[in-house]
């Protein structure tokens, strides 16, 4: 089955999620969708 990256880097500030996951470019894989940082 698929092997993929699923990074969930974020911090919580005043109950609001602030993500700092790095931008996903075409050289790193395809965005899986509906998850955090998942590429394949």
């Amino acid at each position: 089955d698929a092997e993929f990256r699923h990074d969930s880097g974020y911090e919580v500030h005043h109950q609001k999620l602030v993500f700092f996951a790095e931008d996903v470019g075409s050289n790193k894989g395809a965005i899986i969708g509906l998850m955090v940082g998942g590429v394949v």
């Epitope: 969930s8 999620l17 075409s26 395809a30 965005i31 899986i32 998850m35 955090v36």
Partner: antibody, heavy 121, light 111 residues
């Protein structure tokens, strides 16, 4: 604008195979995985799996393991879903879809128009 | 596999009134304080459309009358003031792990 355009309706006999295509446009094809979801007449939604246009790696719902194959052709920005050993229960509308990750700053989805596959003897 | 169960199966609500749909997962769909729970709207003859993601966040272009709540295993979709164009089937779905799975759907009609 982002578009996913699927191939036309198919009628197949039990035991046969069907190959549905999904042609993507309006974005860089290799940047998003393409998912397949099916819906039997009057029924709910069922996730079949996805394939990565970037790597060609696929992840399938175990329910379809051994019967489903998802591939891509980067030269035509097209993804294919092939389902073999068809039975009447496979009669459904098959959708391809693309989703954003939660961390994109905005999240939306794009769906093909659906392809009706009818399995009948 | 995670099983998603929705209730009720159908719901008739007067125009302008509140509609509430429930969704329960067979196990937690939370991970690192995020709920991987999404809601879709599907109108007849159309593909589904993402309304709510991460349990509470509105998808792009979704009207403010649609809101989501919950965490862990129990979730709710609320339409605060039902409009005629909201007649549809609504599905919850988890994207925490593969295979992704959907609830059986809730049909919303006008009373």
């Amino acid at each position: 604008q982002v578009q996913l355009v699927q191939s036309g309706a198919e009628v197949k006999k039990p035991g046969a195979s069907v190959k549905v295509s999904c042609k993507a446009s309006g974005y860089t094809f290799t940047t998003y995985a393409i998912h397949w979801v099916r819906q039997a007449p009057g029924q709910g939604l069922e996730w079949m799996g996805f394939t990565s246009p970037y790597s060609g790696v696929s992840n399938y719902n175990q329910k379809f393991k051994g019967r489903v194959t998802m591939t891509r052709d980067t030269s035509t920005s097209t993804v294919y879903m092939e389902l073999s050993s068809l039975r009447s229960e496979d009669t459904a509308v098959y959708y391809c879809a693309r989703f954003d990750n939660y961390d994109r700053g905005y999240v939306r989805d794009y769906w093909g128009q659906g392809t009706l596959v009818t399995v009948s003897s | 596999d995670i099983v998603m169960t929705q209730s009720p199966d159908s719901l008739a609500v007067s125009l302008g009134e509140r509609a509430t749909i429930n969704c329960r997962a067979s196990e937690s769909v939370d991970n690192d304080r995020i709920s991987f729970l999404n809601w879709y709207q599907q109108k007849p003859g159309q593909p589904p459309k993402l309304l709510i993601y991460a349990a509470t966040k509105q998808g792009t272009g979704v009207p403010d009358r649609f809101s989501g709540s919950g965490s862990g295993t129990d979730f709710t979709l609320t339409i605060s003031s039902l409009q005629a164009e909201d007649v549809a089937v609504y599905y919850c779905s988890q994207s925490k792990e593969f295979p992704w799975s959907f609830g059986g759907g809730t049909k919303v009609e006008i009373k």
